[in-house]
């Protein structure tokens, strides 16, 4: 029988250590220009100077010195469009995933001094410049304020704001996390005349309360209006204010389409089309119907009108509308027609051109792959990303469609640039795409480059991670493979991380890392040096990541397979993959583990409790344990409602607690932060209770006052050290 013992052979290169990972020794840099015109951008230098660059004249100079930044401890900045002022952001204080509060100072570039008089209040929840000039909109204590100039007194636009009750211009918890994915809910019109904002009324939403222990004698209680599946949701209204005369007409309410307003609904996004045209997207609570509504400002009425013939309905018959979110429209120059990604008749998400009705939409891209994001639409070009190239779903390339041509011609801008090094790109375009930056995330070392938007010619390398390249020269990195396996008509892509001196004739322990959530993707051609890289490099563990059913960018049949039955196929497909890996001959069947975080913690828990005997041990970090405990928008998107006449039965069947007995024959490590605002500690508390009630032995670790990311330096070090010990013990690896 082949030896089970793996020992790295003599080599001048050293293996990665856990310390390397925890210290972030091998982290990479990216370079995103902060575009301020067609050919100019700003960038914060390593030493914190704010530098201005003109691509065409090749001039560069410091517009704001690091000493000015340092004088207020600023960590971020924002230049006003008239280039007269800069806001400086300091005292960053994180709230949820995207939201934070900060102190803002306004610096007058003309006079070289901070604006005095009518200083901004603190802490501010959100602040932004108008797209033209130097008007400021900001949110303070859940209300929106407007300054016509930085030195002017503010006009208070809203007065209804109330902590944990009514939010103006910023989302509540559930909208921030599950719908908007932003810290803001206000949008300036392109000319800065109008300001659109959302009011979220959380007055009737149940509160999640948890203790924050801090250092005091008594813990603090954190209260968050958090609608769990089936609970009362936020009530949303959209308003638009004329910022020239905000005190005349007051906020103008934008009407909700009738077919949406007839039952519970969500606001999903707002896009300004022109100075007097706005596009709102709405979604029914049962998230298979989305309505895009184009509204116009009627000067004669002084109101926003949303005609029925400017409502476009998007519906899914096989699952939910959109991917993770419903896509947003990219309007063309005529301010009437737009490009949008949605499922074609074969169930693949593709770009469509809508001129009048969705029924008459012209399909722009097609094939058994998916268009992922539309970056920019100009007079003659449309730039988008997709995973078409060479049929790898986990790649991202940037394409240009010349829409001026008839028929439109397609060109892959990135496919052949640095083919081995770069297969996963994103891009950042100047206003009308005269220039753009490409940021490549791997599989080789990330690199950021600047390009001419007409010719696609590379102009300069912005960041190539030379230092990282040098420091990795003496490191034994594992080998990464991305391949696919087939099972009964299904294809599963997987990423395998193999120890440095991998030998197929030997047997290795296997660790499955899983996420597996709907519309997620784990098998991506990106560079990473992280915990699992270390486990392969130093501990000789084979790591595998598998994208099972429910994951994204492989068509709706694959994606919607999990609709209304979470926790079934995601688990089944991980088990299938493990069996296939065993068949490959180099996996030690007695040393297989699985771990995951969040949705991955849910899947790993269910996999461990599958009763298959495949896994010796596993770890669940911050797992969901029941979809009834999770946020309404997310749970219901994929599971429907937890009511008898809808899908309560599967809500109950798909809990981790229901499988408590099946944990008896595995080593289970359950980990959760006590201040998790997202997947509440309640989830793990209920798993632990069920395991105790079933008299099942297990290990657990909580992280006091840590949120869903368990990201404080000390906690993170402890977490990964603890998981490493657990895994090495499980795999009988010496310390």
């Amino acid at each position: 029988r082949p030896s089970r013992v793996y020992k790295p052979e003599g080599n001048t290169k050293r293996a990665l250590t856990l310390k390397d990972i925890l210290n972030g020794t091998f982290s990479y840099k990216t370079y995103f220009p902060n575009w301020i015109s067609e050919q100019e951008y700003l960038h914060q230098s390593e030493d914190d100077n704010i530098v201005f660059y003109n691509i065409e004249t090749r001039e560069s100079y410091i517009i704001l010195s690091n000493s000015t930044m340092k004088s207020v401890n600023a960590t971020d900045y924002g230049l006003s469009p008239d280039r007269q002022f800069v806001y400086l952001e300091s005292d960053y204080s994180k709230l949820w995933r995207y939201s934070y509060t900060a102190t803002y100072y306004i610096y007058d570039l003309q006079n070289g001094e901070f604006v005095r008089g009518y200083e901004l209040p603190r802490p501010i929840q959100y602040l932004c410049w108008s797209p033209v000039g130097s008007k400021l909109a900001y949110v303070y204590q859940n209300n929106i304020y407007l300054k016509q100039r930085p030195g002017d007194p503010p006009f208070q636009i809203t007065y209804t704001g109330r902590e944990n009750r009514i939010f103006n211009g910023i989302p509540d918890w559930v909208y921030e996390e599950e719908m908007l994915a932003t810290k803001y809910a206000l949008w300036w019109s392109p000319d800065g005349k109008f300001l659109a904002y959302v009011e979220f009324n959380d007055s009737d939403i149940p509160i999640i309360a948890y203790s924050y222990y801090g250092d005091g004698q008594y813990p603090r209680t954190i209260n968050i209006p958090y609608p769990k599946a089936g609970a009362k949701n936020p009530v949303v209204r959209v308003f638009i204010v004329d910022t020239t005369y905000p005190h005349h007409v007051g906020p103008m309410e934008v009407p909700v389409p009738e077919m949406i307003a007839s039952s519970d609904y969500y606001f999903s996004w707002l896009t300004w089309v022109s100075s007097e045209r706005v596009c709102l997207q709405w979604l029914k609570r049962v998230q298979n119907v989305s309505v895009l509504s184009i509204c116009d400002f009627r000067e004669d009425w002084h109101a926003w009108e949303c005609p029925k013939n400017q409502e476009h309905v998007e519906e899914s018959r096989t699952g939910w509308a959109g991917g993770f979110f419903v896509s947003t429209p990219a309007f063309s120059q005529d301010a009437t027609s737009y490009y949008k990604i949605f499922s074609d008749k074969d169930g693949y998400k593709h770009i469509h051109y809508i001129k009048d009705t969705v029924e008459n939409a012209i399909q722009i891209t097609s094939g058994k792959w998916e268009a992922i994001y539309i970056f920019r639409v100009t007079q003659d070009s449309l730039f988008y990303s997709s995973n078409e190239f060479e049929g790898y779903p986990g790649r991202r390339n940037i394409y240009r469609i010349s829409i001026g041509n008839s028929p439109p011609s397609k060109k892959c801008v990135t496919c052949h640039l640095r083919k081995e090094r770069c297969q996963y790109y994103t891009a950042s375009f100047s206003y009308k795409a005269k220039y753009y930056a490409l940021v490549c995330y791997g599989p080789g070392l990330p690199i950021s480059t600047l390009h001419d938007g007409r010719t696609d010619q590379e102009i300069q390398v912005l960041e190539e991670n030379k230092e990282l390249e040098n420091s990795l020269r003496n490191i034994q990195l594992p080998k990464v493979e991305i391949k696919k396996l087939k099972d009964g008509g299904l294809t599963f892509w997987y990423k395998m991380i193999l120890p440095p001196q991998f030998d197929r004739s030997k047997k290795y322990p296997l660790l499955i890392q899983v996420y597996g959530g709907p519309c997620s993707q784990s098998v991506k051609s990106v560079f990473a040096v992280n915990w699992i890289t270390y486990l392969a490099s130093k501990e000789g563990i084979v790591i595998a990541l598998v994208d099972g059913r429910g994951t994204a960018f492989q068509g709706d049949k694959f994606l919607h397979a999990v609709y209304r039955k979470l926790g079934v196929y995601e688990v089944e497909d991980q088990l299938t993959a493990v069996r296939k890996f065993i068949e490959m001959g180099f996996i030690d069947e007695e040393r297989i583990a699985i771990w995951g975080w969040s949705y991955g913690g849910y899947v790993s828990s269910l996999a461990l409790a599958s009763g298959t005997g495949l896994f010796k041990c596993g770890i669940a970090v911050a797992p969901v344990s029941s979809w009834e405990y999770y946020a309404s928008i997310y749970s219901e998107r994929f599971m429907g409602l937890p009511t008898k006449d809808d899908n309560l039965e599967h809500y109950k069947n798909s809990t981790v607690m229901a499988r408590a007995e099946y944990f008896r024959n595995v080593d289970y490590l359950l980990i959760h932060g006590t201040a998790d605002d997202n997947v509440h500690f309640q989830n793990s508390a209920q798993i632990a209770k069920a395991l105790v009630n079933a008299q099942v032995d297990f290990q657990a670790m909580w992280y006091s006052d840590q949120n869903h990311g368990i990201s404080s330096g000390r906690s993170q070090n402890h977490l990964y050290t603890h998981m490493t010990h657990f895994l090495k013990q499980c795999f009988s690896l010496s310390d």
Epitope: D152, P153, F155, Y245, H247, H248, G250, M252, H302, A303
Partner: antibody
């Protein structure tokens, strides 16, 4: 031509109620914020309440909060002010005006409310 | 709330003369949010000056508004007989909107 016509004023006892109406014409009523402004005999102007075009947001002066309710019926182009628990100091000419916090560019002729026993 | 103080309380002038009315705010308002109204006995107020010291529709150009921050002025370049009335300034930057106590322009 824009016209605002108030009605419903009169004599009422302290603690009593009154409902003022303002019939609007000559503009798209539902699109505009409307306010009530009052003027006590021989005194200056005092803003009382405002409501946005859709009726979805309302504001009140502290002196009337909890006693007065502003509302509108856009199908009837009419603005209302329901006044409860009236006091002697509420005696005034009540004007309806087109506008939110300012820029009151059109005013009605006013209706007199007298609170007296 | 923002307190607006108008001065003088009464201004006695003859037709053809220049009238200068003052309005001082307890905190900065800016001209964007300050308006002037005219009211004649037994009539409703009438908007004269609006956002950014602009004249309202139909207001003769002898009326002009100026000022910024906390100090504002309404100027009537040549008084006409129909201009004798009470004038009010009003701020709309902050809730509640407030009016000055008024300046009465009377015939001397």
């Amino acid at each position: 031509e824009v016209q605002l016509l108030e009605s419903g004023g009169g004599l009422v006892q302290p603690g009593g109620s009154l409902r003022l109406s303002c019939a609007a014409s000559g503009f798209t009523f539902s699109s505009y914020a409307m306010s009530w402004v009052r003027q006590a005999p021989g005194k200056g102007l005092e803003w009382v309440s405002a409501i946005i075009g859709s009726g979805g947001i309302t504001y009140y002066a502290d002196s009337v909060k909890g006693r007065f309710t502003i509302s509108r019926d856009n199908s009837k182009n009419t603005l209302y002010l329901q006044m409860n628990s009236l006091r002697a100091e509420d005696t005034a000419v009540y004007y309806c005006a087109k506008g939110w916090f300012g820029g009151f560019n059109y005013w009605g002729q006013g209706t007199l409310v007298t609170v007296s026993s | 709330e923002i307190v607006l103080t108008q001065s003088p309380g009464t201004l006695s002038l003859s037709p053809g003369e220049r009238a200068t009315l003052s309005c001082r705010a307890s905190q900065s308002v800016t001209s964007s949010y300050l308006a002037w109204y005219q009211q004649k006995p037994g009539q409703a107020p009438r908007l004269l000056i609006n956002v950014g010291s602009r004249r309202a529709t139909g207001i003769p150009d002898r009326f002009s508004g100026s000022g910024s921050g906390t100090d504002f002025t309404l100027t009537i370049s040549r008084l006409e007989p129909e201009d004798f009335a009470v004038y009010y300034c009003q701020q709309g930057i902050m809730l509640p909107p407030t009016f000055g106590q008024g300046t009465k322009v009377e015939i001397k």
